[in-house]
């Protein structure tokens, strides 16, 4: 990695005059669970925790639920969606279900979102077992501009799991574009 | 990357004095399939190779099944579980399995466990295909303090595929704390 | 991280002299649509983009569908690779698919390949929906050596999804080897 | 409901300026990005620029670079539009609109009610 | 820029007829396409969005299709209230740009 290049306008020797420079930017981002919308169709995720629990941000913003990059560089971006079902909340709203999350990147430079990464699973829950739980993962290494901003879309939003180690999406800096 | 300063104690200025600053922490620590608990209940896994294939620990150590952080940072954390089922091995516990995994911090300062991560799935096991394969994969950014622990809790031990390709758990360190 | 010491033969005083290195090894592939294999035998996919869309490579080679490593070091890998199926595609090869992938090393001084990661799951696609969708993530933390390849090996690449955001592999140098 | 109104018709001569407002109501302002897009008498529909209202990002149509400065004010959930060296050729009917980025739409809705906008020496 | 060229720009129907408008793209812009109604005097409406979805509200006679540089809005039985300038938009990339429009009167 380029390590603290990525945050400086000078040189290596600057940095070394200078001391530690700034953090390089990171978020790791939990779901608001008293903000999960309803419904079964598709829908972005508005509302993200950025300081309790596991959640964290550093030279990152969040903002109507969209993680916006302040500082141009390559990101390890990631996603971890979790749906689950008790036959005690009622029936799913079809047996077969597609369980579905995109990471999506939108910017004031592009009209339309483009879908980053996606990942999921169609799924029978219908009777038989009274508990069902299912989790996707995905992640991948992108350049992202300042000004950009990340968000997370999902099927079925009425079957996440609200627990801050089950649905959450993050970032980290990993070098500087040249 | 705050790159070097997360792993001295001086200035930038010491380190291109001294030259190379120490590698950053790490593990990525593989099954051991001798060890591997039976049953269908919730287990820790307290056994896991880190010196041979493709396991291996730098400024980390690891302890009863337990991976312990020897110096603050950010790390990114990740765990790939795999199930397999043979006819041939007899029947599953259960035909509605929850194949789940859980990535754990302990702390000698928090008396109890705390969940980072997990994922999985409820499948049906049942009859009609002689061979069932399950993978799971989570992976997220957190913060960790020297002394803090990470442990791999899994539901059905005895259905882990044990290769070294299928069932490991690592970890890296990103940055610094400021 | 190590940062730049990963990329310079010389001391951390010769960085600060010289200003920023050279950007660390990183790569992002992304499935050519035009060449999935049929079938569904276990292949390795042997095409994929570097240029185009989020694809991208530096420091690295993308050489018939291999990923070449030109720098020692540990690397953090990745793998996202989706299977879908519509009714209107014709049936699927068999109602008890095996969806699996395989993340592999070569080395020309190694004749065999070794699986670094696996992830998958069986899966039952006979009839009762039109549509059917599955996705893998794996990642990991491992050393690699110049010369070394990176490759996927998918069973049923008939089904893979096309999309750039289903399907796709990379990897990023976190830090140098001591 | 989900609403944008605009300020009304204007009246300008070559060379100078004119500044639209479209006041939103009815949702988050800062949550969707604002859209200007102007129609000429008898034509068709030209696209000016964009401001995301949470943070001030704007991008504009090339033709107009130099000439249109969009702006908003978070305050009063008001996004405005200013067109400087008005020349005949910008008598149009000005339309701010909303871009739905929340569910995945992407298109325009709704519109203004559109103010008119006449060059005349 | 990306140009959207609209036909026919103008169109004579009877009520109940099936009505049919093109639009094609100078390039490739996925489904990132929308269809807009617009009355004499007012702001234009969104009836269709990503090619082939259409918008809460609007009735099921309207229909959008298409993919990559080639797309179509059908309205299967023209109503009284349908009469009306109908333009097609991409969202692919900026500047956004729309077709000349389809102007549809009555027969």
């Known amino acids: 990695f380029s390590g603290a290049p990525a945050m400086m306008e000078g040189s290596w020797l600057d940095v070394a005059q200078r001391g530690k420079p700034e953090a390089q930017p990171f978020a790791h981002l939990t779901i608001n669970a008293a903000s999960i919308p309803s419904g079964s169709h598709k829908v972005t995720l508005s509302s993200w925790y950025h300081d309790r629990g596991w959640a964290k941000i550093s030279n990152m913003t969040l903002s109507n639920g969209k993680l916006r990059v302040n500082q141009d560089g390559f990101y390890y971006l990631y996603a971890n969606i979790c749906f689950r079902h008790h036959e005690t909340s009622g029936s799913v709203p079809t047996d077969y279900l597609q369980l579905m999350v995109y990471v999506v990147k939108t910017s004031i430079k592009i009209p339309s979102s483009h879908n980053l990464m996606k990942g999921g699973s169609t799924k029978n829950w219908s009777g038989n077992s009274e508990f069902h739980f299912y989790s996707i993962n995905v992640g991948g290494f992108f350049k992202l501009r300042a000004g950009e901003e990340i968000s997370i879309q999902v099927s079925n939003p009425s079957l996440l799991d609200p627990d801050q180690d089950a649905t959450y999406f993050g970032a980290f800096k990993v070098q500087d574009i040249d | 990357f705050s790159g070097a300063p997360a792993m001295m104690e001086g200035s930038w200025l010491d380190v291109a004095q001294r030259g190379k600053p120490e590698a950053q922490p790490f593990a990525h620590l593989t099954i051991n399939a001798a060890s591997i608990p039976s049953g269908s209940h919730k287990v820790t896994l307290s056994s896991w190779y880190h010196d041979r294939g493709w396991a291996k620990i730098s400024n980390m150590t690891l302890s009863n099944g337990k991976l312990r952080v020897n110096q603050d940072g950010f790390y990114y954390l990740y765990a790939n579980i795999c199930f397999r089922h043979h006819e041939t091995s007899g029947s599953v516990p259960t035909d509605y399995l929850q194949l789940m995994v859980y990535v754990v911090k302990t702390s000698i300062k928090i008396p109890s466990s705390h969940n980072l991560m997990k994922g999985g799935s409820t499948k049906n096991w049942s009859g009609n295909s002689e061979f069932h394969f399950y993978s799971i994969n989570v992976g997220g950014f957190f913060k960790l303090r020297a002394g803090e622990e990470i442990s791999i809790q899994v539901s059905n031990p005895s259905l882990l595929d044990p290769d070294q390709d299928a069932t490991y758990f690592g970890a890296f360190k990103v940055q610094d704390i400021d | 991280f190590s940062g730049a010491p990963a990329m310079m033969e010389g001391s951390w005083l010769d960085v600060a002299q010289r200003g920023k290195p050279e950007a660390q090894p990183f790569a992002h592939l992304t499935i050519n649509a035009a060449s999935i294999p049929s079938g569904s035998h276990k292949v390795t996919l042997s095409s994929w983009y570097h240029d185009r869309g989020w694809a991208k490579i530096s420091n690295m080679t993308l050489s018939n569908g291999k990923l070449r490593v030109n720098q020692d070091g540990f690397y953090y890998l990745y793998a996202n690779i989706c299977f879908r199926h519509h009714e209107t595609s014709g049936s699927v090869p068999t109602d008890y698919l095996q969806l699996m992938v395989y993340v592999v090393k070569t080395s020309i001084k190694i004749p065999s390949s070794h699986n670094l990661m696996k992830g998958g799951s069986t899966k039952n696609w006979s009839g009762n929906s039109e549509f059917h969708f599955y996705s893998i993530n794996v990642g990991g933390f491992f050393k690699l050596r110049a010369g070394e390849e990176i490759s996927i090996q998918v069973s049923n690449p008939s089904l893979l999804d096309p999309d750039q955001d289903a399907t796709y592999f990379g990897a990023f140098k976190v830090q140098d080897i001591d | 409901q989900v609403q944008l109104v605009q300020s009304g018709a204007e009246v300008k001569k070559p060379g100078s300026s004119v500044k639209v407002s479209c006041k939103a109501s009815g949702y988050a302002f800062t949550n969707y990005y604002i859209e200007w897009v102007r129609q000429a008498p008898g034509q068709g529909l030209e696209w000016m620029g964009v401001?995301?209202?949470?943070?001030?990002?704007?991008n504009y149509n090339e033709k107009f670079k130099g000439r249109v400065t969009i702006t908003a004010d978070k305050s009063t959930s008001t996004a405005y539009m200013e067109l400087s060296s008005l020349r005949s050729e910008d008598t149009a009917v000005y339309y701010c609109?909303?871009?739905?980025?929340?569910?995945?739409?992407?298109?325009?809705?709704?519109w203004g009610q559109g103010t008119t906008v006449t060059v005349s020496s | 820029d990306i140009q959207m060229t609209q036909s026919p720009s103008s169109l004579s129907a009877s009520v109940g007829d099936r009505v049919t408008i093109t639009c094609k793209a100078s390039?490739?812009?996925?489904?990132?396409v929308a269809w807009y109604q617009q009355k004499p005097g007012k702001a234009p409406k969104l009836l269709i969005y990503?090619?082939?979805y259409r918008y809460s509200g609007v009735p099921s006679r309207f229909s959008g299709s298409g993919s990559g540089t080639d797309f179509t809005l059908t309205i299967s039985s023209l109503q009284p209230e349908d009469f009306a300038t109908y333009y097609c938009?991409?969202?692919?990339?900026?500047?956004?740009?729309f077709g000349g429009g389809t102007k549809v009167e009555i027969k």
């Open positions: 390039q490739n812009v996925g489904t990132n």
């Open positions: 938009q991409q969202y692919w990339d900026y500047p956004l740009t």
């Open positions: 990503s090619a082939s």
């Open positions: 401001i995301n209202p949470g943070w001030g990002d704007t």
């Open positions: 609109a909303r871009r739905d980025t929340a569910h995945g739409y992407y298109a325009l809705d709704p």
